[in-house]
């Protein structure tokens, strides 16, 4: 990526890292308002299976692994990207490496959920305080989960689906920060590992993933009021290990793997019409990206 200053524009969809033949160091940003892509400063170490989030206008890349011809190293790294300077800087590492991690943000704190280190599938969860540059373990999940989808709604952290080392999962659980405890919620209709999970209009959406047999294009959403999962329109492409985010009331899914091809496709879901449309293509196909949107 270029090392010049990034243009000072509004809300962008950032995609970091990913995998195509090897872990990638790309940082690119999509501007939905004009359909353009920006090539930004590379990650300092290539990684896939990472997660992305934004706190205080800064983009964080969390966990993953560097799968390269030279070897395969799971990552405990937390790195911070400043859009104003177009530069990455390292932060305090997590307590353990976490590949295929999920992350969520509550009250400016980053929660790192599950993931794997070698053949160890974590149920542990840790919280990062940016102002102190410190990680602290919180209560572990009730289930070991890698390829877990994580979302925050009403200051509660939801961990959805994944793989426990033996089975792909349709189960989901919710973390209550004030109580420091996890509780199971209604299971999804579909087993999903490596799904895209996000929040839109008071619902948690789970898109795509892998059910242990096939990649999925189905999408379902959880209504916290009724505690039920309901299917919505399917994506055009089957995909697992996809990136997902919400931008101006619409869901964007980026890339992923369809069982044969690394997708460059970016689809957008409009909840008003319950339809998916192809909106752009990434500069190259990839799976296992970290995705986040800058704040206003």
């Amino acid at each position: 990526g270029s090392m010049g200053h990034a243009p000072k524009v509004g809300r962008l969809i950032y995609t970091a890292g990913g995998y195509f033949r090897q872990s990638l160091s790309y940082l690119e940003a999509y501007n939905p308002s004009d359909g353009t892509w920006l090539d930004l400063a590379d990650l300092q170490v290539p990684r896939s299976g990472l997660a992305g989030c934004v706190v205080g206008g800064l983009l964080y890349a969390v966990g993953g692994r560097n799968n390269s011809p030279d070897g395969n190293t799971d990552s405990s790294a937390l790195d911070c990207y400043n859009p104003m300077t177009n530069q990455w800087s390292p932060c305090a590492p997590m307590s353990v490496p976490r590949n295929r991690i999920g992350v969520g943000v509550i009250d400016g704190h980053i929660y790192a959920v599950g993931g794997s280190h070698g053949c160890i599938h974590h149920n542990s969860v840790e919280r990062y305080e940016p102002e102190r540059d410190e990680w602290h373990l919180v209560a572990p999940m009730l289930t070991r989960r890698i390829g877990v989808g994580v979302a925050v709604l009403n200051r509660l952290l939801y961990a959805v689906g994944g793989f426990d080392g033996t089975n792909r999962l349709n189960s989901a659980e919710c973390y209550y920060p004030e109580r420091n405890e996890w509780r199971m919620i209604t299971a999804m209709n579909t087993i999903r590992s490596g799904a895209g999970v996000c929040v839109l209009h008071n619902c948690i959406y789970a898109a795509g993933g892998y059910d242990g047999q096939d990649q999925l294009n189905s999408v379902e959403r959880y209504d916290v009021e009724t505690e039920t999962w309901t299917f919505v329109a399917p994506m055009k492409h089957r995909r697992s290990a996809l990136g997902i985010t919400v931008h101006q009331g619409r869901i964007y899914v980026l890339g992923g793997y369809d069982g044969h091809t690394f997708l460059d496709s970016v689809e957008c879901y409009d909840p008003d019409t319950d339809t998916w449309s192809e909106v752009t293509r990434m500069t190259s196909g990839r799976s296992g990206v970290g995705v986040a949107v800058t704040m206003e």
Epitope: S48, G118, G212, Q215, Y257, G288
Partner: antibody
Framework: EVQLVESGGGLVQPGGSLRLSCAAS????????IHWVRQAPGKGLEWVAS????????LYAKSVAGRFTISADTSKNTAYLQMNSLRAEDTAVYYC?????????????AGQGTLVTVSS | DIQMTQSPSSLSASVGDRVTITCRAS??????VAWYQQKPGKAPKLLIY???SLYSGVPSRFSGSRSGTDFTLTISSLQPEDFATYYC?????????FGQGTKVEIK
């Protein structure tokens, strides 16, 4: 019945290329990690490469990294090992295997193997 | 890379004997160890995975155990069809590595 049938082996000169195929029946290759394991004549087993069905990520032994490529075509229910820049030390029987879903890189079921001979 | 040191390299035993084969990992591999049986000209067959789990269809005379970084395959009562070469494998971290094999021969 689960079956894996390897093909594509043969005699090739050093520096040459071969593509091995592994045709699966009785299960979907999309439902398992697929591995290639090899065995040089009179020697032990060596893990070569794996492909993850969920992410598409591949892993390679250092001895073959950059020369070999593992891939899968779910529409044909077949996995492949593309072998380039072959060396004499790549001479071996190559086995395709699926894992058991409970322990990665565990060759729960392997095919009969295909012999690759690299010699001038 | 993690080394798996297997011993003995060969052993002679009689039908009905109790046979023990060990593998030592050069570093911690948790319980991510499998054991295989291979007969000449044939593909390896999985016996044990996750150190001690018996793979489906494998006779119960085969068992596996772990003590730290030491792993053991035990055949409680050797049968004629058990004369073969046995390999351990670690899949804790990549590259996955095998032991050098133990050939079980008829005494």
């Amino acid at each position: 019945e689960v079956q894996l049938v390897e093909s594509g082996g043969g005699l090739v000169q050093p520096g040459g290329s071969l593509r091995l195929s592994c045709a699966a029946s009785g299960f979907a290759i999309s439902a398992s990690s697929i591995h290639w394991v090899r065995q040089a004549p009179g020697k032990g087993l060596e893990w070569v490469a794996s492909i993850d069905p969920e992410t598409g990520e591949t892993l390679y032994a250092k001895s073959v990294a950059g020369r070999f490529t593992i891939s899968a075509d779910t529409s044909k229910n077949t996995a492949y090992l593309q072998m380039n820049s072959l060396r004499a030390e790549d001479t071996a029987v190559y086995y395709c295997a699926r894992d058991n879903g409970r322990a990665r890189a565990t060759a729960a079921y392997a095919g009969q193997g295909t012999l690759v001979t690299v010699s001038s | 890379d993690i080394q798996m040191t297997q011993s003995p390299s060969s052993l002679s035993a009689s039908v009905g004997d109790r046979v023990t084969i060990t593998c030592r990992a050069s570093q911690s591999v948790s319980s991510a160890v499998a054991w295989y049986q291979q007969k000449p000209g044939k593909a390896p067959k999985l016996l044990i995975y996750s150190a001690s789990s018996l793979y489906s269809g494998v006779p119960s005379r085969f068992s596996g155990s772990r003590s730290g970084t030491d792993f053991t395959l035990t055949i409680s009562s050797l049968q004629p069809e058990d004369f073969a070469t046995y390999y351990c494998q670690q899949s804790y971290s990549f590259p996955s590595t095998f032991g050098q094999g133990t050939k079980v021969e008829i005494k």
